[in-house]
């Protein structure tokens, strides 16, 4: 909902959390043959003034962190997205019940930072 | 401060917002010739699901989302951030007082996505 | 023209909550955020927080955190400012005040006054 | 938190005379984003000043703010009736948005 992760307590600055995903709590149980499930982990934290080399900003997530400490009503922090995505390869059946083996592209956050 | 963007109603859905920056709000005045300032522009707005064709989500997003259907208090919406982004050329004094032309990547939003 | 309309005086016993609104006419409402800031007998404007009318997005003074909740109603161009757990001290006029990007307060309320007494 | 400091607490002059008064800020103010108010008695504060010199709207050009980093000042020439009042700096570049405790202008 739109009111998740409101909380007035200080987040950690931006990085990268593991997250395991099943495809059966996904509900992808019957057509994914393989994996069972992948480490897809998840970016999660603050962008804060001052954004540090840690943090992967870019010149424009810089920018808008002083932009945002000046005008917070108006400009949102930079937010931590993947940086680093990697592909998975899935086994699967097709709309026609064939076995089919792809890769999937930008599945496993590697890497997290300020955009 | 850490209770900013806590609004627990609806957000409009994650679209590039225009900003223009001046370099002299940022404070930048005395080191930058020129340009005066530029349209930075920013990146806002929900990534719910469903996430639609517009949003630019990668697999990843589009996984993310549905874990925190499932588990909203555990993994949050995958995050709208830029998804193209182009370069500005800066008249700048450098340390030693010397007129530099420099080219900053990253530095305009051209497009938001969901990641 | 471009204004904020704030509602009338209260008395309120300490420890209850008080709820004052500032109606905005003549701009488009959502284009701005509006903020909240008191006065006390002799003493300076303090700062309580703002809220986005685009969004609904709020931050609060360290001060008020937990005791002051702003929102708004886009249908009725308002905002409201709710201010709990009275105490003599929270006597005060308080107003609304608009901020544009990169600006300080343009346009006030006239002030709405507020009195905790036993 | 920036603090500011106003000086002085209060300023007795006669109409027509020159009004200045002074602003501290705690720790530089590179943007300059320092705004001058004037408040009357009963009323709700007005702007004056924004940028720590552009006037707002209506504001005559009598009235002038100047200053730089830490000391900043509002001038008012040639004092009219609607000037006596308090005046109040304001720091709005980063939150929380600090006042100054105020200089009051009075007749004489």
């Known amino acids: 909902s739109a009111s998740d992760y409101n909380s007035s307590e200080l987040k950690t600055a931006c990085r990268k959390h593991e997250l395991y995903v099943s495809f059966q709590d996904l509900g992808w149980q019957d057509w994914i043959i393989a994996p069972k499930g992948y480490a897809a982990n998840y970016c999660d934290g603050e962008c804060s003034f001052p954004l540090n080399a840690h943090m992967n900003a870019t010149n424009h997530a810089i920018v808008q962190t002083l932009v945002h400490l000046m005008n917070p009503e108006y400009v949102p922090k930079p937010c931590c997205a993947p940086t680093k995505l990697n592909a998975i390869s899935v086994l699967y059946f097709d709309d026609n019940s064939n076995v089919i083996l792809k890769k999937y592209r930008n599945m496993v956050v590697r890497a997290c930072g300020c955009h | 401060s850490a209770s900013d963007y806590n609004s627990s109603e609806l957000k409009t859905a994650c679209r590039k917002h225009e900003l223009y920056v001046s370099f002299q709000d940022l404070g930048w005045q005395d080191w930058i010739i020129a340009p005066k300032g530029y349209a930075a522009n920013y990146c806002d707005g929900e990534c719910s699901f469903p996430l639609n064709a517009h949003m630019n989500a990668t697999n990843h997003a589009i996984v993310q989302t549905l874990v925190h259907l499932m588990n909203p208090e555990y993994v949050p919406k995958p995050c709208c951030a830029p998804t193209k982004l182009n370069a500005i050329s800066v008249l700048y004094f450098d340390d030693n007082s010397n007129v530099i032309l420099k080219k900053y990547r990253n530095m305009v939003v051209r497009a938001c996505g969901c990641h | 023209q471009v204004q904020l309309v704030q509602s009338g005086a209260e008395v309120q016993k300490p420890g209850a909550s008080v709820k004052v609104s500032c109606k905005a006419s003549?701009?488009?409402?959502?284009?701005?955020?509006l903020h909240w800031v008191r006065q006390a007998p002799g003493q300076r404007l303090e700062w309580l927080g703002w809220?986005?009318?685009?969004?609904?997005?709020?931050d609060y003074s360290w001060k008020f955190q937990g005791r002051v909740t702003l929102t708004r109603d886009t249908s009725a161009n308002t905002v409201y400012m709710e201010l709990n757990s009275l105490t003599s001290e929270d006597s005060a006029v308080y107003y609304c005040?608009?901020?544009?990007?990169?600006?300080?307060?343009?346009?006030w309320g006239q002030g709405t006054l507020v009195t905790v007494s036993s | 938190e920036i603090v500011l400091t106003q000086s002085p607490g209060t300023l007795s002059l006669s109409p027509g005379e020159r009004a200045t008064l002074s602003c501290w800020a705690s720790?530089?103010?590179?943007?300059?984003?320092l705004a001058w108010y004037r408040q009357k008695p009963g009323q709700a504060p007005r702007l004056l000043i924004s940028?720590?010199?552009s006037r707002a709207t209506d504001i005559p050009d009598r009235i002038s703010g100047s200053g730089s980093g830490t000391d900043f000042t509002l001038t008012i020439n040639r004092l009219e009736p609607e000037d006596f009042a308090v005046y109040y700096c304001?720091?709005?570049?980063?939150?929380?948005?600090?006042f100054g405790q105020g200089t009051k202008v009075e007749i004489k």
């Open positions: 005040a608009r901020r544009k990007l990169w600006s300080p307060f343009d346009i």
């Open positions: 003549g701009y488009t409402f959502t284009s701005y955020a």
């Open positions: 809220i986005s009318a685009a969004n609904g997005n709020t």
């Open positions: 720790q530089s103010l590179t943007n300059s984003f």
């Open positions: 940028g720590a010199f």
């Open positions: 304001q720091y709005y570049g980063t939150s929380p948005w600090t």
